[in-house]
């Protein structure tokens, strides 16, 4: 197995996590996918999970956390709006594949949300767009009480998080710093260690 | 390793049908969109279409010079892309090229090495 | 249709020497922060090779003297050092909307 990767997110109370999780294969656009904090000694718990199929560009929303799987993209939008100190934790983004076990998509998350705002009110043209509003179309869906106990042994393909906050609240003045992204593994890579039970010849990308 | 070959070019006269065929080896085919991309004696490259995966209902794109007149489509169990050319016009003669993404809406990572297609009475 | 556009068409570069080609989309080829811009090499009799995806990204076994930036609309490939074996015609390309389009290439050779 693949060494576990990690990526740390350290945000304000307030702000909003961004996460877009890469699945790349049109195999899994109408799998049900999932939002997962990881606590010490504990299987992954589902927090937010699409419907079943998963339906295109369908926003659903349980709580402060938004799911939005883009199909045509081969993309998870999660985004975790309003973040309270609580949040922080480990978070992964999977796929539900009944009856095998779920699979992580991409690095696990390590939110740290701290107390407090950066930068200035006012504009916020750098930012992203502003997500802080939820919004008023949104399904909650109803998630598998299973959860894997050896979820993710897969290095990730890719996976890109940003913030954004109220205009009001706060100026992002360098949102780089917050972007962060990660290189991509092959597709075949992803493919033989989702679902494919041949023995293909794997290359990486660096 | 991925493999791309091309095969059914050759000469034809304008208003004439020609059907070329991709057989790919080295990956699980029926997992990936395949397109097809030609290129005029030095010219550019000019996408072609795509022909999606059976989870996608093998849907089909192409591109504005030729939909209506080509048509791609796909054998999984034959590991094999294709591509039907109807009428075709004098400007149809490239080297056509079939290319696997890597995903959804992803880069040509493979290219076979094309087939030569000339259209002239 | 989205339409790529490269500058130069051509260009010449002294070998050592860096090379930049510019890609230009008329409307943005981002879907949030992922850039579905892709960079190509054609060396004559050749069928084109994969550079770089999704703007910045350096596909396994090219040359680390090969990069990318850029994104919404404006997209850069650079060689930082030109090698001989670099001579070839470089295209961009885009798959975030249908139809996909290529830029018209531009070559480039030593100086």
């Known amino acids: 197995a693949t060494k576990l990767t990690e990526e740390k997110y350290e945000l304000k109370e307030g702000q909003t996590l961004d996460v877009k999780c890469d699945y790349t294969l049109e195999k899994f656009a109408s799998s049900q996918k999932a939002w997962q904090i990881i606590r010490d000694g504990e299987m992954p718990k589902t927090l937010a999970c699409t419907e079943r199929p998963s339906k295109n560009s369908h926003p659903v929303q349980v709580g402060r956390i938004i799911l939005e799987d883009y199909h045509d993209h081969g993309l998870l939008r999660v985004r975790m709006v309003n973040l309270q100190v609580e949040d922080s934790g480990l978070y992964q983004c999977v796929i539900y594949q009944p009856p095998k076990e779920p699979h992580m998509l991409f690095a696990r998350i390590r939110l740290v949300v701290t107390k407090g705002f950066s930068g200035t009110p006012g504009s916020n043209e750098n930012s992203t767009q502003n997500v802080y509003k939820i919004p008023p179309t949104t399904t909650k869906a109803l998630c598998p009480l299973y959860t894997s106990p050896r979820t993710v042994t897969q290095a990730p393909p890719k996976s890109t998080a940003d913030v954004s906050t109220p205009d009001s609240e706060i100026n992002l003045t360098n949102v780089t710093d917050i972007i962060r992204e990660q290189k991509l593994i092959s597709e075949e890579d992803l493919e033989q260690k989702l679902i494919s039970e041949e023995d293909l010849h794997h290359h990486h990308h660096h | 390793e991925v493999q791309l070959v091309e095969s059914g070019g050759g000469l034809v006269q304008p208003g004439g049908s020609l059907k070329l065929s991709c057989a790919a080896s080295g990956f699980t085919f029926s997992t990936y969109a395949m397109h097809w991309v030609r290129q005029a004696s030095g010219k550019g490259l000019e996408w072609v279409g795509r022909i999606r995966t059976k989870s996608s209902n093998y849907a089909t794109y192409y591109a504005a010079s030729v939909k209506g007149r080509f048509t791609i489509s796909r054998d999984d169990s034959k590991n094999t892309a294709y591509l039907q050319m109807n009428s075709l016009k004098t400007e149809d003669t490239a080297v056509y090229y079939c290319t696997r993404d890597m995903g959804i809406r992803r880069q040509f990572a493979y290219w076979g090495q094309g087939t030569l297609v000339t259209v002239s009475s | 249709d989205i339409v790529l556009t490269q500058s130069p068409d051509s260009l010449a570069v002294s070998l050592g020497e860096r090379a930049t080609i510019n890609c230009r989309a008329s409307e943005s080829v981002d879907t949030f922060d992922y850039s579905f811009l892709h960079w190509y090499q054609q060396k004559p009799g050749q069928p084109p090779k994969l550079l770089i995806y999704?703007?910045?990204n350096l596909e396994s076994g090219v040359p680390d003297r090969f990069s990318g930036s850029g994104s919404g609309t404006d997209f850069t490939l650079t060689i930082s050092s030109l090698q001989a074996e670099d001579v070839a015609v470089y295209y961009c390309?885009?798959?975030?909307?249908?139809?996909?389009?290529f830029g018209q290439g531009t070559k480039l050779e030593i100086k």
């Open positions: 999704r703007a910045s």
């Open positions: 390309q885009q798959s975030n909307e249908d139809p996909y389009t």
